[in-house]
């Protein structure tokens, strides 16, 4: 058993049939010695008397808010949550495995630039009685500060018969150094509490590995006289790190015909303009990636050719 | 470069960008492999990193690029020695068309661009001996290449910025 926060305790349980559970001793936070009784949740039924209450915690029926009373007045509370371990593995019932980029990916994180700001998100099918808290640091043995904002419900989607909820959080490294080579990874820890179930999820990454630029902006097409060719231009996204002479992007461009099956020629360039043949009903697209480190490509930005 | 002369920024830019390409072709799936393990915070101390105080940011380069260039050169020599060590030459043998050979040569080439003949900066000691097991060697290769990718990315940014803003 360990204290998650004031008056909230997590009991770690090996979860198998007829498991013995954990013996927990609760102590009433009061100078009083006599006439103390204990109850659980909204029930007024007395579970025991005395300054301490010893319980055998085996399952969720044993978890909840224990309160000690004297003379009809509540003296202190202890909320017991359970953290299940099955076959040596902590339960992951609350969050959905996103399976990208690999199995057992519950938290996904992205950064739009090297400023030390990043966003993490996760998915669940649970709609009520759910709370999350997030902590983050750079490194774990001698952690450096990362400040995370409030967790927000960022999207709701219908997946077949189920509704899926996406939660996200934004974090900022306190003393980010965009130009340096990261030596220690960022650690993100999410505590999830669903009713009386506690779970925790972690992710460890370098900002450089989770970079995904925003799509290029201001796509423009300029037809060339007496030619089927068009000069296309675009700009770095506003959210990308500056100066661009230092934080450079590379681009992938393509012209896509109306038919998805039509062959697309992709061209890679470090410039912010190109000359392409852009037929009627086709569209021109461009995406961006860090020029020197192969992290994610941005989403495509597109304009119609006509 | 030592003693305050400017490097051939444009040449360094080209070669460092080539290094980036080679480092990724030597170990392309790096983003999908989680090679970090318990205790990695300690093992990463072995390799030289371009850190915050090394003056490799745009402002630091403008003020005095020498600190940064010295740091980059130290790292290049360190990785060049690693790629020439039995970590990479021992079993399991690299494929004949492996880019590691080119990568090794390019590291040497760029480090020489930063130090003309006759100048000798102190360099870091080569790290501890190579592991004996082939599988350990393979894992160490991946870790070194992953670390090299991060190092050469910063170096390439430095030379690109230098070529654009500091070239005479």
């Amino acid at each position: 058993i360990w204290e998650l926060k004031k008056d909230v305790y997590v009991v770690e349980l090996d979860w198998y049939p007829d498991a013995p559970g954990e013996m927990v001793v609760l102590t009433c936070d009061t100078p009083e010695e006599d006439g103390i009784t204990w109850t659980l949740d909204q029930s007024g039924e007395v579970l025991g008397s005395g300054k301490t209450l010893t319980i055998q915690v085996k399952e969720f029926g044993d978890a909840g808010q224990y309160t000690c009373h004297k003379g009809g007045e509540a003296l202190s509370h202890s909320l017991l949550l359970l953290h299940k371990k099955e076959d040596g593995i902590w339960s992951t019932d609350v969050l959905k495995d996103q399976k990208e980029p690999k199995n057992k990916t519950f938290l996904r994180c992205e950064a739009k630039n090297y400023s030390g700001r990043f966003t993490c998100w996760w998915l669940t099918t649970i709609s009520t009685d759910l709370t999350f808290s997030v902590k983050s640091s750079r490194g774990s043995s001698n952690p450096q500060g990362v400040t995370c904002g409030a967790v927000t419900l960022s999207a709701e989607r219908v997946r077949g018969d189920n509704k899926e909820y996406e939660y996200s959080v934004e974090c900022q490294e306190d003393s980010a150094c965009p130009a340096a080579e990261e030596r220690l990874p960022i650690e993100v820890m999410v505590d999830a509490i669903h009713k009386l179930k506690y779970e925790n999820y972690t992710s460890s990454f370098f900002i450089r590995d989770i970079i995904k630029p925003d799509p290029p902006k201001n796509l423009q097409l300029k037809p060339l006289k007496n030619s089927r060719q068009v000069e296309v231009s675009w700009e770095y996204p506003d959210t990308w790190s500056t100066p661009h002479s230092y934080f450079s992007l590379t681009f992938c461009i393509q012209v896509q015909g109306k038919s998805k099956r039509e062959k697309k020629d992709r061209i890679f360039t470090d410039k912010t303009s190109a000359t392409v043949i852009c037929r009627k009903n086709a569209s021109f697209s461009v995406q961006a990636q860090d020029r020197y480190y192969s992290s994610s490509w941005s989403e495509w930005a597109s304009v119609p050719c006509s | 470069v030592p003693g305050g002369s400017s490097p051939a920024w444009a040449q360094c830019q080209q070669l460092s960008q080539k290094l980036c390409t080679l480092a990724w072709s030597a170990h392309p799936l790096v983003g999908h492999m989680d090679l970090r393990e318990e205790g990695d915070e300690e093992t990463t101390n072995d390799v030289p990193h371009i850190q915050c105080g090394d003056g490799c940011d745009p402002q630091g380069l403008r003020d005095n690029s020498q600190f940064c260039l010295q740091r980059i050169r130290q790292g290049l020599i360190f990785y060049e020695k690693l790629l020439g060590s039995d970590i990479f030459t021992g079993e399991p043998s690299l494929l004949p068309d492996s880019p590691v050979g080119q990568l090794h040569a390019s590291l040497l080439g760029l480090s020489q661009l930063l130090q003309p003949e006759g100048h000798h900066w102190e360099t870091q000691q080569i790290p501890s001996p190579s592991p004996s097991q082939p599988w350990q060697r393979l894992l160490l290769r991946f870790k070194i290449l992953r670390s090299l990718q991060a190092f050469v990315a910063v170096a390439a940014r430095v030379f690109a910025h230098g070529a654009a803003t500091l070239s005479p």
Epitope: L40, Q42, V46, L47, G61 | -
Partner: nanobody
């Protein structure tokens, strides 16, 4: 809908024995403490005995040494074995259980049975 149904109450001679049973049924997620209370005519309802989920019993002074509370968690039942009954044990005996239901599956609330009459004649 949750129901607590008591049984076993009847007229018995002083010094005799009775066994009361209570079964909880309906949509029940889990049961915490289960208890027996009684209310004699013109008096307040008083606790007789309680048993926790783990099986620890607790008795009111009037029940000590004569009454035994037991429960079967698998069947959601609680029993009260009453020996050496006295006329002052005459009362309606109520079963009480702290239940979690699907609506409140992480909060225990108290549910009561309708009661069973025990009469001890001298």
């Amino acid at each position: 809908e949750v129901q607590l149904v008591e049984s076993g109450g009847e007229l018995v001679q002083a010094g005799g024995s009775l066994r009361l049973s209570c079964a909880a049924s309906g949509s029940i997620v889990s049961i915490s403490a289960m208890a027996w209370y009684r209310q004699a005519p013109g008096k307040q309802r008083e606790r007789v005995a309680t048993i926790t989920r783990g099986g620890t019993p607790d008795y009111a002074d009037s029940a000590k040494d004569r009454f035994t509370i037991s429960r079967d968690n698998a069947k959601n039942t609680v029993s009260l074995q009453m020996n050496n009954l006295k006329p002052e044990d005459t009362a309606v005996y109520y079963c009480k259980a702290a239940l979690r239901t699907p609506t409140h599956d992480y909060n225990y609330y108290d549910y009561w049975g309708q009661g069973t009459q025990v009469t001890v004649s001298s």
